[in-house]
């Protein structure tokens, strides 16, 4: 038996009390697929969140982050403060990378310099807080035709592993607040 609500297109919801009646979504709500029995409240991009795409009756709003912050989480559910290159974000704010580590991005954590000697190389260019070392040839590599400079081994993907992630909940809006999540991530339903 065909669901009487299947005829209701996106932007409407099926009135359960009256079969086959499709009601337009009320203001600031949406249904992105047909056959829905409810419309969901539009996401509001407030505070550090910025509207990237307006809500419509057929699709939710999309948010990104204001300058100085970057998105984290599915659908930009959180905004995390940017740091400078050569820094990482901690609960107390942006801190310089410790000696022997670097970060070449505005986000993520400081990563150890490449250990050239593990590949039998020598350090050609010293590392800094912002840049990895550049490994140079070992004496054995100086034979004709050998490449003179080897790029460092690929660093781990920027971003946090679970142990390293510095998450600060939105309720804690004190001076150390560096990561802001949305208040309204759960869905509200019309009807």
């Amino acid at each position: 038996l065909q669901d009487p609500c299947s005829n209701c297109p996106a932007g409407t919801f099926c009135d359960n009390n009256r079969n086959q009646i499709c009601s337009p979504c009320p203001p600031n709500s949406f249904s992105s697929a047909g056959g829905q029995r409810t419309c969901d409240i539009c996401r509001q991009c407030k505070g550090v969140f910025r509207t990237r795409k307006e809500c419509s009756s057929t699709s939710n709003a999309e948010c990104d982050c204001t300058p100085g912050f970057h998105c984290l989480g599915a659908g930009c559910s959180m905004c995390e403060q940017d740091c400078k290159q050569g820094q990482e974000l901690t609960k107390k704010g942006c801190k310089d990378c410790c000696f022997g580590t670097f970060n070449d991005q505005k986000r993520g954590i400081c990563r150890p310099w490449t250990n050239c000697s593990l590949d039998g190389k020598s350090v050609l260019v010293n590392g800094t807080k912002e840049r990895d070392v550049v490994c140079g040839p070992s004496p054995a590599d100086l034979s004709p035709g050998a490449s003179s400079v080897t790029p460092p081994a690929p660093a781990r993907e920027p971003g946090h592993s679970p142990q390293e992630q510095k998450l600060i909940s939105e309720e804690d809006l004190g001076g150390e607040q560096k990561l802001i999540s949305e208040e309204d991530l759960h869905h509200h339903h019309h009807h």
């Epitope: 005829n7 996106a10 932007g11 009646i21 499709c22 979504c25 203001p27 419509s56 009756s57 057929t58």
Partner: antibody
Framework: QVQLVESGGDVVQPGRSLRLSCTAS????????MHWVRQAPGKGLEWVTF????????YYADSVKGRFTISRDNSKNTLYLQMNSLRAEDTAIFYC???????WGQGTLVTVSS | DIQMTQSPSSLSASVGDRVTITCRAS??????LNWYQQKPGKAPKLLIY???SLQSGVPSRFSGSGSGTDFTLTISSLQPEDFATYYC??????????FGQGTRLEIK
């Protein structure tokens, strides 16, 4: 900014036809359903018809069913109302509005008179 | 169809007054009630949606409350630009979309 502009209103004789247009700008027209709402001189608001974002679903007030047809051309950002068999009681300002009824046009006057 | 009844039909008030307009639905409409303001020769303007949510750009002196069948629109301190006609509208069981008959707010 969101703008809706109606056109096509005129003075017509009873029994004749008229087509109204509503041109939208400032928002993604193809993502919104659209309404026509009318207001007789000195009277309240009366909803007339609704069309879904893709044109697949339409609904009419009983007072216009079988006489009025709503349609849209998303490539032209335009909503239409074809009005046939017009009656004196159809005399009104006709407004188009987004499905949320949060933005309305300025209205176009239809006068049905012999 | 759900009928919407507004009271009063007209109202005289002065600048600075607190004004309340009521709207009653013929059956429960939960919180699916919107309020509009219309000035002469102009299109209606959405003020309040979902009974109590203020539409973007609307002054905070406007507020809405209620659920089920009884709703109110309150203007906390009337300004000269608030003299207009106000309509309630249910979005619970539509179509047809139904409006109240309107409340005309006039200067005393």
């Amino acid at each position: 900014q969101v703008q809706l502009v109606e056109s096509g209103g005129d003075v017509v004789q009873p029994g004749r036809s008229l087509r109204l247009s509503c041109t939208a700008s400032g928002f993604t027209f193809s993502s919104f359903g659209m309404h026509w709402v009318r207001q007789a001189p000195g009277k309240g608001l009366e909803w007339v018809t609704f069309l879904s974002y893709d044109g697949s679903y339409k609904y009419y007030a009983d007072s216009v069913k079988g006489r009025f047809t709503i349609s849209r051309d998303n490539s032209k950002n335009t909503l239409y109302l074809q009005m046939n068999s017009l009656r004196a009681e159809d005399t009104a300002i006709f407004y188009c509005a987004r499905d949320w009824l949060d933005y309305w046009g300025q209205g176009t006057l239809v006068t049905v008179s012999s | 169809d759900i009928q919407m009844t507004q009271s009063p039909s007209s109202l005289s008030a002065s600048v600075g007054d607190r004004v309340t307009i009521t709207c009653r639905a013929s059956q429960s409409i939960s919180s699916y009630l919107n309020w509009y303001q219309q000035k002469p020769g102009k299109a209606p303007k959405l003020l309040i949606y979902a009974a109590s949510s203020l539409q973007s750009g609307v002054p905070s002196r406007f507020s809405g409350s209620g659920s089920g069948t009884d709703f109110t629109l309150t203007i906390s301190s009337l300004q000269p630009e608030d003299f207009a006609t106000y309509y309630c509208q249910q979005s619970y069981s539509t179509p047809p979309i139904t409006f109240g008959q309107g409340t005309r707010l006039e200067i005393k």
